[in-house]
């Protein structure tokens, strides 16, 4: 497992730009994996999008979101993942250790646990950005 | 357009509990990511945390994710924000927000006033 070199924690205005770019990246994701016919998702794997240990804007947890697409990638090897693990190591900002993910073997239930952690990450993007862009807004109907 | 109407707000002790919810009407409810937003006296408005239109959950904080329990009930149309534990520092006026896929919320209530103290 590698780790990643210290930066400096970014400005909202710049995790909002990634994070944009994320959930565009993740809904390309999703649509390509939904084309899989008669996979369910399943309630077995849950993606954890917010870090326990950090604050916004600089909470979204990049180390194991990204560990998960990886290991997407290595049964499914998408090529908008590469793109994703990219700008998720922007959003990672102190040395991390790896997530371990445990794999399903079975190959109906990897292409479950695909589409699930697709599905939630894509969500994960979309609620983070609503986060992020609905704090300067007036609570107002 | 969506139309959204806190309830469930009011005066409770340290360590007591509530349940807001947030009814909407106007539109096709199970669609949209749903989400609450709090604001205390002098301070930003802070995200407390949203919901999937799948039931798909993110917190803005392990506190709140240890405290606060984000559901909803798309047959009711009605979103929900179950609050344990309460402190003072939970004092604020809390609304509930909607919003479609890839856009910010754009629909928003009037707030409901929780005040925690003895």
């Known amino acids: 497992s590698h780790t990643l070199p210290v930066r400096l924690l970014r400005p909202s205005d710049d995790v909002q730009k990634i994070v944009e770019e994320l959930q565009s990246l993740s809904k390309m994701l999703l649509k390509d994996v939904e084309e899989e016919k008669g996979v369910l998702v399943s309630q077995n794997y849950t993606l954890p999008c917010l870090s326990p240990d950090a604050q916004p804007p600089n909470n979204i947890h990049s180390p194991a979101i990204r560990a998960y697409l990886k290991t997407i990638r290595q049964l499914d090897n998408k090529s908008v993942i590469d793109e994703i693990i990219e700008h998720l190591d922007k959003l990672i900002f102190q040395d991390a250790p790896e997530t371990n993910i445990s794999v399903p073997t079975d190959t109906h239930e990897c292409k479950r646990f695909i589409l699930t952690i697709s599905q939630q990450f894509s969500e994960c993007m979309d609620l983070a950005l609503k986060s992020l862009t609905s704090g300067a807004q007036q609570a107002t109907t | 357009e969506v139309q959204l109407v806190e309830s469930g707000g009011g005066l409770v002790q340290p360590g007591g509990s509530l349940r807001l919810s947030c009814a909407a009407s106007?539109?096709?409810?199970?669609?949209?990511?749903m989400g609450w937003f709090r604001q205390a006296p002098g301070k930003e408005r802070e995200y407390v945390g949203g919901?999937?239109?799948?039931?798909?959950?993110?917190y803005n904080s392990e506190s709140m994710k240890g405290r606060f329990t984000i559901s909803r009930d798309n047959a009711k149309n009605t979103l929900y924000l179950q609050m344990n534990s309460l402190r003072a520092e939970d004092t604020a006026v809390y609304y509930c927000?909607?919003?479609?896929?890839?856009?910010?919320?754009?629909?928003w209530g009037q707030g409901t006033q929780v005040t925690v103290s003895s």
């Open positions: 106007g539109g096709t409810f199970s669609s949209y990511t």
């Open positions: 927000a909607a919003g479609t896929i890839g856009r910010p919320y754009d629909y």
């Open positions: 919901i999937s239109s799948s039931g798909y959950v993110m």
